[in-house]
Structure formats: C-alpha cells, structure tokens
Interface confidence: low
Amino acid sequence: SEVEYIAEVGQNAYLPCSYTPAPPGNLVPVCWGKGACPVFDCSNVVLRTDNRDVNDRTSGRYWLKGDFHKGDVSLTIENVTLADSGVYCCRIQIPGIMNDEKHNVKLVVIKPAKVTPAPTLQRDLTSAFPRMLTTGEHGPAETQTPGSLPDVNLTVSNFFCELQIFTLTNELRDSGATIRTA
C-alpha cells in the first residue's frame, strides 16, 4: 500500500520522490500524475520534466523544489485543498523497455483543527508548539513564539510536518544527500 503523507488545507504538501542520476548529471524525464501509476506514463499529469527542466505544469501550485540535478524530484503542492487528496504517481522514465521506476504516494488533506484554549493555558501551549515561520518558500526554518495570541490556531500536525521537512531539507540540501521521509 502507498505511504501516506498528511497536509492541512491551505498548507504546502510535500510528496517525496528521488532517483540517482547515472552517471551524475544524466537526468531522465519524470512525470507526476494524479492517480496510481498506470502501465505507461502518468495519468492526469500535474507536472512533467525533461532532461533540462520542468516543461509542463498544469498549475502554478506544483513545484519541484529539491536538488533537481541530483535527482530529487519530490513534488510540492502549494496551498492544498481537500480536492488534492488522493494517490499520486511519481514515474522516473528510465530509457528502455519497462525500466521505469514507479512510486505511488497517498496525500491525505485534512481540515485544520482550530483550538481556542483557556487563557491560563494559552502561554503554555504557544511555548510548547511555537509557530514555524519560513523565509521564502523553502528557506531556513525559524522558530518564533508569539507573545500574546487571543486565538491560537493550534495546528500540531502542521508544526511537526514543517519542522521535519524544512529542517531536514535545509540540513541535507548542500550535502547532496537524498531526502526520504515516511
């Protein structure tokens, strides 16, 4: 069964996929599609690459933000909605008959749980779950604890998701390591 990845409505979803170019720099075409990987190509293509760059995106919300030239073709879907839920196929189109690598991943989009804690609890909650702020779309994660919040949007899963993805990505980016999350 597919590995599940959870994202909240309005947040960015990250679906990992990677390969090792052999020899290094010898990139191969990749497609991402909505729906399980079919026999050939991708169904309902959302993004496609060639040997040089992304050459087909059905929406500006779909991005490859990884180290593309090292084979990190993980898909980022910006500002997800409930309609983005479902199985996605990452197909690495290695030349030759039936050589393709196929990876099915499942995206589960959930509504954010809005919690309005009692005032006495508020400070403890914001300290325990500081909001994750990022510089740019995928810049270094900074942790900030807001001072006084009359209404705390406590998105615990989002906090851990962003903490895991952004810090891991930034730590490994320049090392050239392949980023895999489960």
Epitope: P24, G25, D67, F68, G136, E137
Partner: antibody
Framework: EVQLVESGGGLVQPGGSLRLSCAAS????????IHWVRQAPGKGLEWVAD????????EYADSVKDRFTISADTSKNTAYLQMNSLRAEDTAVYYC??????????????WGQGTLVTVSS | DIQMTQSPSSLSASVGDRVTITCRAS??????VAWYQQKPGKAPKLLIY???FLYSGVPSRFSGSRSGTDFTLTISSLQPEDFATYYC?????????FGQGTKVEIK
C-alpha cells in the same frame, strides 16, 4: 579545486568573429550548466547564453541569438562561445560561470576571471 | 523578460553600518534569486542563493530575504572589504536577468 579559465578575447573589427573558450577543472561540466555573462565597460552584468553539456540544451539572449553559438566538449571539459557578426555593442568582459541544471537552483557559484572582447574599427 | 529593479544605485556608508539593498522583480520569480558581490576588475562572487541561503564561505553578516516579489540583501555590520558593487539576479525564467547594481562606497 574548482576553476574556470576563459581565453580567446581580443580586438576584432565590426562584422568579425571570435571564439572564446572556458576551460573547467575540479568538476565535470557534464553535470552542470555553463553560462556566459558579459559586462560592458562601466556597466552591469548581462547574461549571454548557457549550455547544459550533459543534456545538450542551449539558450541565448535575444541580443546575441543567431550570431553567437555556445557549445561544449565534455572530453576536454571545456565550453565555447563562437561569436560572429560582432558589433561595437558586444564590447565587454566575457565571463563563464558554473550553474545548475534545474533553473530554480541555477545561481552561479564559480566564475572565471573574464576575457576582454573589443569590437572596434 | 523579467525586470529586476535594484535600489539604491549607490550608497555611502561607514564601517559598522547596517546596509540594505533591495531588488523588485517585475513578476513572480518564486525564490529563484541570487545576490553577487563584485569588486573592480574582478569577477562577481556568489553571496546568497535561493533568496535567503548563505553561500558557503560567505560571512554571516550577509543575509537575504524575500517578501513576495521584493528581495533584500542586508549587511548587518559593514566591513572594509564589503565596499563593492552588489547585483541581484533572477534565474526563474530565461533569460536570467540582473539588477543594475548597487555601488557601496565609503562615506
């Protein structure tokens, strides 16, 4: 150590030709993009062309399209810029620089020392 | 083509000053912006890539940030070796384009 060394610059008459070379060492150009960037005297930086030797993709600025040709020889680890029909406005220091295959990461982390091209009669 | 409007074109500052240079893209470039430093007669050097990432070996007094299509290079405490010309560049679409440069001079 990563190094880029340009050569081939000089004085040429309008309408003439020059071939610039960019010899790379310390890395395999087939894994990267190689860019040519120029700088006219006292002016800013202008991108000219790029090539991804591993994939064979080439791109050009409109100002040089159909006049300049970028190429690479991976066996020599060298990129070239063939400049034809040169004009006075092509006078500049020409730098080669190393970039990356995917444009989202394609900043230029290593640059050559530059070679001066002067187009004048 | 995407225009990168850089400001100011020049500035005078003293050692220890905090210096801010801005670049505005004429359309969305995501985080595909780099900053370079160039000294007279020398090739440019990469300082910041992907809008906010400090390039290896660059002093931590340099930082970059993004707000929409506005990009900022900040030098927190100007040092004597920082007097140079600085360029922003977008590499989101072809052709890659540079800002016109900001010359940082000694006051």
């Amino acid at each position: 150590e990563v190094q880029l060394v340009e050569s081939g610059g000089g004085l040429v008459q309008p309408g003439g030709s020059l071939r610039l070379s960019c010899a790379a060492s310390g890395f395999n150009i087939g894994n990267y993009a190689i860019h040519w960037v120029r700088q006219a005297p006292g002016k800013g930086l202008e991108w000219v062309a790029d090539i991804t030797p591993g994939q064979g993709y080439t791109e050009y600025a409109d100002s040089v399209k159909d006049r300049f040709t970028i190429s690479a020889d991976t066996s020599k680890n060298t990129a070239y810029l063939q400049m034809n029909s040169l004009r006075a406005e092509d006078t500049a220091v020409y730098y080669c620089a190393r970039g990356y295959v995917y444009r989202m990461w394609d900043s230029y982390d290593y640059w050559g020392q530059g070679t001066l091209v002067t187009v004048s009669s | 083509d995407i225009q990168m409007t850089q400001s100011p074109s020049s500035l005078s500052a003293s050692v220890g000053d905090r210096v801010t240079i801005t670049c505005r893209a004429s359309q969305d470039v995501n985080t595909a912006v780099a900053w370079y430093q160039q000294k007279p007669g020398k090739a440019p050097k990469l300082l910041i890539y992907s809008a906010s990432f400090l390039y290896s070996g660059v002093p931590s007094r340099f930082s970059g940030s993004r707000s929409g299509t506005d990009f900022t290079l900040t030098i927190s405490s100007l040092q004597p070796e920082d007097f140079a010309t600085y360029y922003c560049q977008q590499h989101y679409t072809t052709p890659p384009t540079f800002g016109q440069g900001t010359k940082v001079e000694i006051k």
